[in-house]
Amino acid sequence: MMTGTIETTGNISAKKGGSVILQCHLSSTMAQVTQVNWEQHDHSLLAIRNAELGWHIYPAFKDRVAPGPGLGLTLQSLTMNDTGEYFCTYHTYPDGTYRGRIFLEVLESSGGGGAGGGGHHHHHHHHHH
């Protein structure tokens, strides 16, 4: 039975040109995490973190996506086009797949959004799908 819960950084905002940390955490399960996929709203994969093989950052994002911290992902040089949903998909054994959602709003530099390491955020919990 799948008992786990994913906690994410929820709805976050950051300034254009700045950076933001996307972070998910899987709890309440003893399942082994074999892989975490980071995905964008339009079916794009940003990165994969395989537990044994390490990080693969997708070619289109190599110049402005940095792995970590931990299983998280850092988006740099933010543009207005980065606004939207992001998903962390945890592949686990034996539970299966867990998915978390983060919504990022990129604000004009003159706006009041957070800069640097993550901007403003609210924690969200997601149960398994």
Epitope: N37, H43, L45, E52, L53, W55, H56, P59
Partner: antibody
């Protein structure tokens, strides 16, 4: 230039153990990457068997996991496949391959030429 | 297990013509797809990774596209050396799987 070369018996008896080695030249297999075995039954598609990571950890196809062992011989710069309790369904060309996960994800960029293993009495 | 289904099984094309090969995944694999070429008696050769990126040294006539569950390998103008079997592979999940292959033959 990285090169991989499979070797081992071309004929194995049913219920026996298939043993193959992959000799790697041009790169030290304990320095990086993951090292894989893939097989192809005659006239059919490709099936991933498993890998050994340069760190020594292994991962196997769940459908074969109970019968497969992949190991590394550092001194000879080679890695090996053992598949136990073989049947005629294990008759295939067996390939070894390298995966550069950081650059190409789960795609395998260097392959050996393959060796045909027939399971028959 | 994610099943990759390729079509058609055989594609007959004249040299110089365009070839379009299809690969469908049984579930969403985003863009975690690679394509390989295999000639008789030879090992597979990596052509495309991440659905649309050409591997080092692969001619520009080979291109990949698609995301989610539907992927396409296009050979814009077939050369004699391109007649071979082509396989797709997914690596979205931790159990990598291949399609059954499409044989591109001379018409």
């Amino acid at each position: 230039q990285v090169q991989l070369q499979e070797s081992g018996p071309g004929l194995v008896k049913p219920s026996g153990t298939l043993s193959l080695t992959c000799a790697v030249s041009g790169y030290s297999i304990t320095s990086g990457y993951s090292w894989h075995w893939v097989r192809q039954p005659p006239g059919k598609g490709l099936e991933w068997i498993g890998y050994v990571h340069y760190s020594g950890s292994t991962n196997y196809n769940p459908s074969l996991k109970s019968r497969v062992t992949i190991s590394v011989d550092k001194s000879k710069n080679q890695f090996s496949l053992k598949l136990s309790s073989v049947t005629a369904a294990d008759t295939a060309v067996y390939y070894c391959a390298r995966m550069d996960y950081g650059n190409y994800g789960g795609a395998m960029d260097y392959w050996g030429q393959g060796t045909l293993v027939t399971v028959s009495s | 297990e994610i099943v990759m289904t390729q079509s058609p099984a055989t594609l007959s094309v004249s040299p110089g013509e365009r070839a379009t090969l299809s690969c469908k995944a049984s579930q969403d694999v985003r863009t975690a797809v690679a394509w390989y070429q295999q000639k008789p008696g030879q090992a597979p050769r990596l052509l495309i990774y991440s659905a649309s990126y050409r591997y080092t040294g692969i001619p520009a006539r080979f291109s990949g596209s698609g995301s989610g569950t539907e992927f396409t390998l296009t050979i814009s103008s077939l050369q004699s050396e391109d007649f071979a079997v082509y396989y797709c592979q997914q690596y979205y999940s931790t159990q990598w799987t291949f399609g059954g292959g499409t044989k591109v033959e001379i018409k």
